[in-house]
Every structure is written in C-alpha cells, then in structure tokens.
Amino acid sequence: MAVTACQGLGFVVSLIGIAGIIAATCMDQWSTQDLYNNPVTAVFNYQGLWRSCVRESSGFTECRGYFTLLGLPAMLQAVRALMIVGIVLGAIGLLVSIFALKCIRIGSMEDSAKANMTLTSGIMFIVSGLCAIAGVSVFANMLVTNFWMSTANMYTGMGGMVQTVQTRYTFGAALFVGWVAGGLTLIGGVMMCIACRGLAPEETNYKAVSYHASGHSVAYKPGGFKASTGFGSNTKNKKIYDGGARTEDEVQSYPSKHDYV
C-alpha cells in the first residue's frame, strides 16, 4: 500500500512540476521592470525567454518575439536549452512512469520491469527538475549581474543636463514558478526512486524452496497469500480466490523482507 501511495504521489507531484516547468518556460515574465525608483510607471517592460513585452497604462500591450538566434546572449540560449531539456526529460519520464504505475496493469509485465521503469522515470524527473532549477538560477544570476551593472550606470548624463534613466530588471513571476516547479519535479523523482526500492523483488534472498512431504507434494511460496498444491504459478498478481472485496495491495504476491523460509 505504502509503495503504491509513494509511487502515485511521486507521479502526481512530478506531473504538477512538469506542468509548472512548461508554464514557466512559456511565460513572458522572466524579468520585469524594477519599479523601486518609480512605482507609478506609464510604461511597464517585461521579458520572457521567447519575447519581450511592453504594457502601457493605456491598457495596450505589445509583445515582440526574439526573431534571431545568433544575436541573443549565450546565457539566454543556455537557459532555453536547459528548460527544453527539462521539459523533454520530464515528458518522457511521465510517459514511462504511467506504464510503471503499480495500479495499472499492462499485459503480464514483470515486477522487475515495473521497478526498472519506476527508477528510470524517477531519475528522469530528478534530472528534469535539476535542469529547470539550473535554468532559472542561471537566468536569475544574469539578472542580478545586470541589475547591479545598470545601477552603477543608472544615470548617464549629457553634460549633466539631460538624464537618461536606464531600465533595470528584476525577478519576474516565471522565475518563482520555475523554481517551485523544478523542486516539485525533483521531489516527485525522489519519491519514484523510493517507490522503486519497494517494488523490486529481491530474488537472491527470496527464492521459492520446495519441501517434499511423505504423502503429497506441497510447495511453500514465501510472501504469497495462499499455499498451493503442486507447483502452481501464483507468484504474480493473480488471485486464486477472492472471497471478499480486497484492495490491489492485499492480493499482492511480492515477497517482503519479513518473509523467511
């Protein structure tokens, strides 16, 4: 039960996280105009990974895409790459984890296969979350650097007569969405990895052993919920008899660490 819960929760948390990473990547507010010196502005600037926008107090908003690849800062390209890698890994991880879910049956999939898939998706989620956190952090660092550089050159005057106020940018909402989403994906991945440990049948310790009694042959299968006569193949998720309503976990035939021969 705990394994299913951990796996399911890991999947849901990762799903929310990846949705957040996608949202953050698409958002326009990665950096927003710093309003510290002028909280009441008539023109508000904000920028995303793909376009920059200007919102006028008249209500009009104009966004322009970055229609160049070579002209963009290398750091911005790196952030884009990290976020896209994060999304792709996360999406593949989600796909893999759907098939790995304990509550979903696909043919006669081995438990070891489910465990491997859970671990694979967990690792993918961890890497995806790290990519998102790294991307957002690189962008945040870039903003901090530019912020202090523009603060140092805040006013460039022409003969001390005319003031040109440089627009400074600060953290936008997308950064916080990205950090939280990356963290959730990371946590989800860790949960999947933990769930994987509970799913994996430790074959070396728990091999079935046969005892031959004088009257008839009885095989005792450790971890099973019913002993069967002969060498029946009930080591998997198959019910011999369901006398009442039971949850999926109550009818599992996985060995546990407390089952000894």
């Epitope: 502005t41 023109v43 904000y46 920059s52 209500g59 009009f60 003031q163």
Partner: antibody
C-alpha cells in the same frame, strides 16, 4: 463617431466640492483607460488624473492628489471626477480623454468649465 | 517630473511653407523595452479641444494628413509641417507619455500670414 460629453462644471467657492461627469458613446468605453486633462485660462494643458480600463489603477499628479478622485462606471459608459477642497488654481476647462496606443490621448470631449472664485 | 520645453512660442508663416516645431524633454522618453519614444503631439484649433496628431514620436494618427511628420529620439523631437495650409492655424502641444505625471509643453502658436 466617438463622442465624449463632459458635464457638471460651474462656478464654485474655494474649499467647495464638485463632481464632473463624462458620458461616452460610439466606442468600447470599458476597453479604454481614461484621463482628465484641464486647460488653464493661460492655455496651458495639465494632466489631472488617469484610470485604467478595469478600474484597478488610478494615477494623479501631486497638485491634485488627495483632493480629486477619478472613477468610472463601465455599465453606464461614464467617467467621473470628484473634486474637493477646490482652489482658485483649479479654475480651468476640464476635458475627459480616452487613452490609445503610446498612452496618447486619442479621443477628447468638448470640455466643461470650472471656475473657483470667492 | 519631466519638463517639456517647446520652441518657438509662436510662429508666423506663409501658406505652402515648411515649418519645424521643436520640443525638448528633461529626460529621455525612449523606452528600451520596445525602442519607442513616448512623445505625443496635439493640435488645438481655436475654440476646439486638442486633437491627437502623432504618438510614439513619429506614428501618425489615422486621418491626419501626411504633411505632418514627427521625428526625433530621446530628448529632442520635431514636428514638421511640410506645406502649411490655412487650416493648420492652431496651437501645437507636445506631451510626455512615458512617465507619470504626464506633462505638456507650453505650446507653439502657429499663425498664417
């Protein structure tokens, strides 16, 4: 054709209050940020107040802050300017204007005259 | 506050002449986000409210004759009337539309001989 019609002006004593109205027609009033602008007897234009399309933000110059309040009723297509603690320097022709691209005052009313005198 | 200075304060010209009206701001009106200058020009004919001519320093409002041209960037702006007509008799105002409080120039009165 866009129509903005101001009303409510008149002769007031210093310290008095007055509420100006601006009725809009022939344009989507609720989509536009609106402003009040006044023109002094010396023909100088002064911006008085701006309100965003959704009523969420209002802006004023220091000269009227705390004395004037801009508001709007999108259901009635009407803009208001509540003026209190009037001073002689508030004497002017008051225009309402609809803001367009570039924060430019795209549409103007014909104006209503406010005179503050003892 | 941004101070807008217009020159000359008045100007008398002959119909058909080319006219240039100047407007200077105490701070740059160029917005780095979209590289647009938030300067607006208005025309006010006698007994009428002001009328929008040009926004973003050089974008002509629809319906405005193409003899009116706005130019300039940063702090120095010009309104050019290529071939002045009798109906251009008016006061021309420039306005800072970049930051609050919005401020207007004192105007240039254009008179026709």
């Amino acid at each position: 054709e866009v129509m903005l019609v101001e009303s409510g002006g008149g002769l007031m004593k210093p310290g008095g209050s007055l509420k100006l109205s601006c009725a809009a027609s022939e344009f989507t009033f609720s989509n536009y940020a609106m402003s009040w602008v006044r023109q002094t007897p010396e023909k100088r234009l002064e911006w008085v107040a701006t309100i965003s399309s959704g009523r969420s933000s209002t802006y004023y110059p220091d000269s009227v802050k705390g004395r004037f309040t801009i508001s709007r009723d999108n259901a009635k297509n009407t803009l208001y300017l509540q003026m209190s603690s009037l001073r002689s320097e508030d004497t002017a022709m008051y225009y309402c204007a609809g803001l367009g691209r570039g924060n430019a005052m795209e549409y103007w009313g014909q104006g209503t005259s406010v005179t503050v005198s003892s | 506050d941004i101070v807008m200075t217009q020159s000359p304060s008045s100007l008398t010209v002959t119909a058909g002449e080319k006219v240039t009206l100047s407007c200077k701001s105490s701070q740059s009106l160029l917005n780095s986000g979209n590289q647009k200058n938030y300067l607006t020009w208005y025309q006010q004919k006698p007994g009428q409210p002001p009328k929008l001519l040009i926004y973003w320093a050089s974008t002509r409002e629809s319906g405005v004759p193409d003899r009116f041209t706005g130019s300039g960037s940063g702090t120095d702006f010009i309104l050019t009337i290529n071939s002045v007509q009798a109906e251009d008799l008016a006061v021309y105002y420039c306005q800072n539309a970049y930051s609050y409080p919005f401020t207007f120039g004192s105007g240039t009165k254009l008179e026709i001989k």
